[in-house]
Interface confidence: low
């Protein structure tokens, strides 16, 4: 007899069918029968746990306790109720050496189990470069292709406009810096984005000295919270005016609220093409 | 500054519930971060008991799931443990904190604990 | 439960002396552990959050490494107020634990 539904898992729920649920009232559905927000549909005799999560595409990568990324939240919690286990968010933003594809449907899919290698040149390959052992001169390759991904103009946090989240995730791996979006549409301020050349491979460019114009206007109004204000902000800036008595909140992309505490489904990202992630 | 304090009996009796309070100062409850509650036996091992979240939801640690319950007063910037049957292994110094944002449960800021002795 | 073990319970060392106490978690936590260090009497007070991260006012001497199993705290230069019970914990997994501690004690 199953102590639980996940006794009964098949690949597309969990079906258990054929024992007497009146002996046992674990398979009639109610708020304790599907784990990790499963959704419980009951047909006839049998009871099965659907993992038909309705995630939206909102690139607001987050890391899991398991070692993979996640598009978004919502792909973490059905990654977790499709292998019925606990995947907290360890940090926002996809994990810094990233070891899974964050669809997380497989077991040792990115389990991002760390193994001891030789320290190397490559080790410092980071925001998606990977590792090219067998070339001259650049070690870190971004074989990121945004050939397909449509127009969706950005703002990123280093000043500069980018025709879609796939570039700036190109720019980010290019450059071996973090670079995120900031914004929907172009930057006030406009610059221009990088190129790769013909290999795969990427130099570093110089860019316009205005680059960081927007950044610095920003500043010149606000300073930053004080420190018992850590956490006044759940996703975003946390800004001082000498204007006002309360501080305020510069929302990161995908978000609102007076706290930044609310998802801003009104915004639509464009995901970027083969990269990193895979989704369900 | 965020501070956090405890406050609650200091004796409580086999079989009754421990009822202890958090006084949060400096920072709204439901403005962010998650409101725990740890334990510190004698022999100075930490248990992390559960959480309050800033909107209201809960995380308990299984193995007090049938006995702990934590709850706020949101008027009063407070939450609330209570631990019903206790035993002589419930005697642990109580404390307090904050958690950090979501993706990071470190605890950044403790109250200054409560000793609570389980005895007759 | 994921079990942290800090497997030495008590180290003796001096004043300026590096110090390195090490945290191994049961499976893996990613980056996802903190640091406290506690002082006789006192609440603790985190030290390293995501395993690597100084928090807020906590001095440069303290530094954290690790990810996956295997962590570390290094104190680069012992101050005579360093001499406390130091713990790890990890929150990769519900219920978030705790190590038994390692207490530095003068030699």
């Known amino acids: 007899f199953p102590t639980s539904l996940s006794d009964c898992q098949t690949p597309t729920g969990w079906n258990c069918s054929g024992y007497d649920d009146r002996e046992n009232d674990l398979f009639l559905c109610d708020t304790n029968t599907c784990k990790f927000d499963g959704e419980c549909l009951r047909i006839g005799d049998t009871v099965t746990c659907v993992c038909q999560f309705k995630c939206n595409n909102d690139y607001v990568p987050v890391c899991g306790s398991n070692g993979e990324s996640y598009q978004n939240e919502c792909y973490l919690r059905q990654a977790a109720c499709k292998q019925q286990s606990e995947i907290l968010v360890v940090s926002e933003g996809s994990c810094a050496t990233d070891a899974g594809s964050g669809s997380g449907d497989g077991v040792h899919e990115g389990s991002g189990e760390t193994s001891q290698k030789e320290t190397s040149t490559c080790d410092i390959c980071q925001f998606g470069a990977e590792c090219d052992e067998d070339a001259e001169d650049v070690w870190c390759v971004c074989n990121i292709d945004c050939s397909q991904t449509n127009f969706n103009p950005l703002c990123a946090s280093d000043g500069k406009s980018y025709d879609n989240a796939c570039q700036i995730k190109e720019a980010s791996c290019q450059k071996q810096e973090k670079i995120e979006v900031m914004s929907l549409g172009r930057c006030q301020d406009n610059t221009t984005t990088t190129t790769k050349s013909e290999d795969g491979h990427y130099a570093r460019t110089d860019y316009a000295e205005n680059a960081n114009k927007l950044e610095e206007s920003a500043r010149e109004h606000h300073i930053p919270c004080p420190e018992h204000y850590n956490g006044f902000c759940m996703h975003g800036k946390c800004e001082h005016s000498i204007n006002m008595q309360e501080p305020s909140c510069r929302c990161d992309a995908g978000y609102t609220g007076q706290h930044c505490e609310k998802k801003d489904y009104s915004v639509l990202y464009v995901v970027p093409g083969p990269v990193r992630f895979q989704y369900v | 500054d965020v501070q956090l304090q405890e406050s609650g009996p200091g004796l409580v009796k086999p079989s009754e519930t421990l009822s202890l309070t958090c006084a949060v100062t400096?920072?709204?409850?439901?403005?962010?971060?998650?409101w725990s509650w740890i334990r510190q036996f004698p022999g100075k091992k930490l248990e992390w008991m559960g959480f309050?979240?800033?909107?209201?939801?809960?995380k308990y640690n299984p193995s007090l799931k049938n006995r702990i319950s934590i709850t706020r007063d949101t008027s009063e910037n407070q939450f609330f443990l209570k631990l019903s049957s206790v035993t002589a292994a419930d005697t642990a110094t109580y404390y307090c904190a904050r958690g950090l944002r979501r993706g990071d449960y470190s605890m950044d800021y403790w109250g200054q604990g409560t000793l609570v002795t389980v005895s007759s | 439960d994921i079990q942290m073990t800090q497997s030495q319970s008590s180290m003796s060392t001096s004043v300026g002396d590096r110090v390195t106490i090490t945290c191994k978690a049961s499976?893996?936590?990613?980056?996802?552990v903190a640091w406290y260090r506690q002082k006789p009497g006192k609440s603790p007070k985190l030290l390293i959050y995501?395993?690597?991260n100084r928090h807020t006012g906590v001095p440069s001497r303290f530094s954290g490494s690790g990810s996956g199993t295997d962590f570390t705290l290094t104190i680069s230069s012992m101050q005579p107020e360093d001499f406390a019970d130091y713990f790890c914990?990890?929150?990769?997994?519900?219920?978030?634990?705790f190590g038994g501690g390692t207490k530095l004690e003068i030699k």
């Open positions: 995501s395993a690597s």
């Open positions: 309050i979240s800033y909107d209201g939801s809960n």
């Open positions: 400096g920072y709204s409850i439901t403005s962010g971060y998650y």
């Open positions: 499976q893996n936590v990613v980056t996802a």
């Open positions: 914990q990890q929150y990769s997994s519900y219920p978030f634990t």
